[in-house]
Interface confidence: low
């Protein structure tokens, strides 16, 4: 059997519905049909059960961890800082996303058997989680920047403003995730499991490029630059002023940001490489195509893993979270009140002192 690869748009259009009279029947096959074997997506059957186990673990950890985080923040009404409000929203986003993981896990094994409605909803939750996550972290970085570099409590004092910012973040995340809601559907293919996939008609490739570049720019690169700017100046101020306590107070936030970057930067870099390849900036080969597909699968797992990591950061680095959790357990008589630390305060990760709101 001879195999040929076809990449020409005009020839593809012809097969998809153009009139045969436009073509010369005696002409030879286009050269691009003769020089390469078809580029088949590599089957990753071996990995799918490993992925399901990862998804199941992340689901359980995320459900437990983020529920506890939300519980602790909601309990500590008195000393709740601005950062706490952002972290509460972050936990909510992760929790909502975690609830979709069993569906994603099942789809890895059986293909997308849940229909178009769930395809749209579940994909939307995944996208909203990602965008709200990075936008909330950008807001935390701005809050830390204002509190430490400019020693201002403007945002801290205006609670309604924080609520408005959080609502705006959710709104903007929904907006950035809108393409998924509009164009995702269940795609049925013969001999292949159905997939939850973008379907934009004949201009699928062009639309997808535009609808990928826009969210990638506004939803990842812009917030990333804001974070780098804010934390750059915040660190400089802390080191210059030798503010030891406040430096310690930044550990949780830096850990949260670092973990976010470690989890989502690889995926976005691979996505960027794929974008460049599809726009012919990088030359496309079958090997590269399969490498990028494999890298997308692998780095996506990292991104999914992120939804359960923030609670672990608070538990291991955030002293106030541990104290808050112990306090809740003591209130409900699950542990003795004597075991509570003496300096245990109601705030989850923060306490306001002077003109700054420090986060632990």
């Amino acid at each position: 059997m001879e195999d040929f690869n076809m990449e020409s748009d005009s020839f593809e259009d012809f097969w998809k519905g153009e009139d045969l009279s436009n073509y010369s029947y005696s002409s030879t096959l286009p050269p691009f049909l003769l020089d390469a074997a078809p580029c088949e997506p590599e089957s990753l059957e071996i990995n799918k059960y490993f992925v399901v186990i990862i998804y199941a673990l992340v689901f359980l950890l995320s459900l437990l961890g983020n529920s506890l985080v939300m519980l602790v923040i909601l309990y500590s009404r008195v000393g709740r800082s601005v950062t706490d409000v952002y972290l509460l929203n972050l936990a909510l986003a992760d929790l909502l996303f975690a609830l979709t993981l069993p569906i994603w896990a099942a789809s890895k094994v059986n293909g997308w058997i849940f229909g178009t409605f769930l395809c749209k909803v579940v994909s939307l939750l995944k996208e909203v989680n990602f965008y709200s996550g990075i936008l909330l972290l950008a807001c935390i970085s701005v809050d830390r920047y204002l509190a430490i570099v400019h020693a201002t409590r403007t945002l801290t004092q205006k609670r309604y403003l924080v609520k408005f910012i959080c609502l705006s973040i959710w709104g903007l995340s929904l907006l950035l995730a809108l393409p998924v809601l509009l164009f995702r559907r269940t795609v049925y293919s013969s001999n292949v499991s159905p997939a939850c996939y973008e379907d934009m008609g004949n201009n699928t490739a062009n639309w997808r490029m535009l609808l990928r570049i826009l969210p990638q720019s506004f939803g990842f690169i812009v917030p990333l630059l804001i974070m780098l700017f804010c934390y750059g100046f915040t660190l400089r101020t802390l080191f210059k002023a030798h503010m030891g306590q406040k430096h310690r107070a930044m550990r949780v936030i830096f850990a949260v940001v670092l973990i976010f970057l470690l989890c989502w930067l690889p995926y976005n870099l691979v996505l960027l490489a794929d974008t460049l390849m599809r726009t012919q900036v990088i030359q496309e080969t079958c090997e590269r195509r399969n490498h990028i597909d494999r890298a997308l699968d692998a780095t996506e797992i990292l991104g999914i893993l992120h939804s359960c990591l923030n609670p672990l950061i608070y538990a291991f680095i955030g002293q106030k979270f541990r104290h808050g959790l112990l306090k809740i357990l003591a209130i409900h008589g699950l542990i003795s009140k004597d075991s509570l630390p003496k300096d245990s305060r109601p705030s989850f990760v923060g306490s306001s002192s002077g003109h700054t709101s420090t986060t632990l």
Epitope: E12, W15, K16, E40, S189, S190
Partner: nanobody, 123 residues
Framework: EVKLVESGGGLVQAGGSLRLSCALS????????MGWYRQVSGQQRELVAV???????DIADSVKGRFTISRDNGKNTVYLQMDSLKPEDTAVYYC?????????????????WGQGTQVTVSS
């Protein structure tokens, strides 16, 4: 592995009929079109007929009214019914399929060809 298996070729008298069939198997994704090309040794390959996923078909002018193309979507099979055969229809007939596979963000557009089946029309 994706395979295209043709059958039905052979030797036939002028004015006679033959039915070629071609079955596509393997991990193929969705089939956008299946069709037939033919090639006389030493000459260029020419398109005979195409059947697209939407149900539309097209036949080359040289065989119009004599050849018909049909498809069994359930079996991923395409047929070429050749009636009123002429000696000039003698050629190797190649089955062709254009498919799309989905993976991540990408649509893989692939083309597959059969080994070819010899059709000889004697006068």
């Amino acid at each position: 592995e994706v395979k295209l298996v043709e059958s039905g070729g052979g030797l036939v008298q002028a004015g006679g009929s033959l039915r070629l069939s071609c079955a596509l198997s393997g991990r193929i994704g969705s089939i956008n079109a299946m069709g037939w090309y033919r090639q006389v040794s030493g000459q260029q390959r020419e398109l005979v007929a195409v059947s697209r996923s939407g149900g539309s078909t097209d036949i080359a002018d040289s065989v119009k009214g004599r050849f018909t193309i049909s498809r069994d979507n359930g079996k991923n099979t395409v047929y070429l019914q050749m009636d009123s055969l002429k000696p000039e229809d003698t050629a190797v007939y190649y089955c062709y399929a254009h498919t799309s596979s989905y993976s991540n963000w990408r649509v893989y557009n692939n083309d597959y060809w059969g080994q070819g089946t010899q059709v000889t029309v004697s006068s």
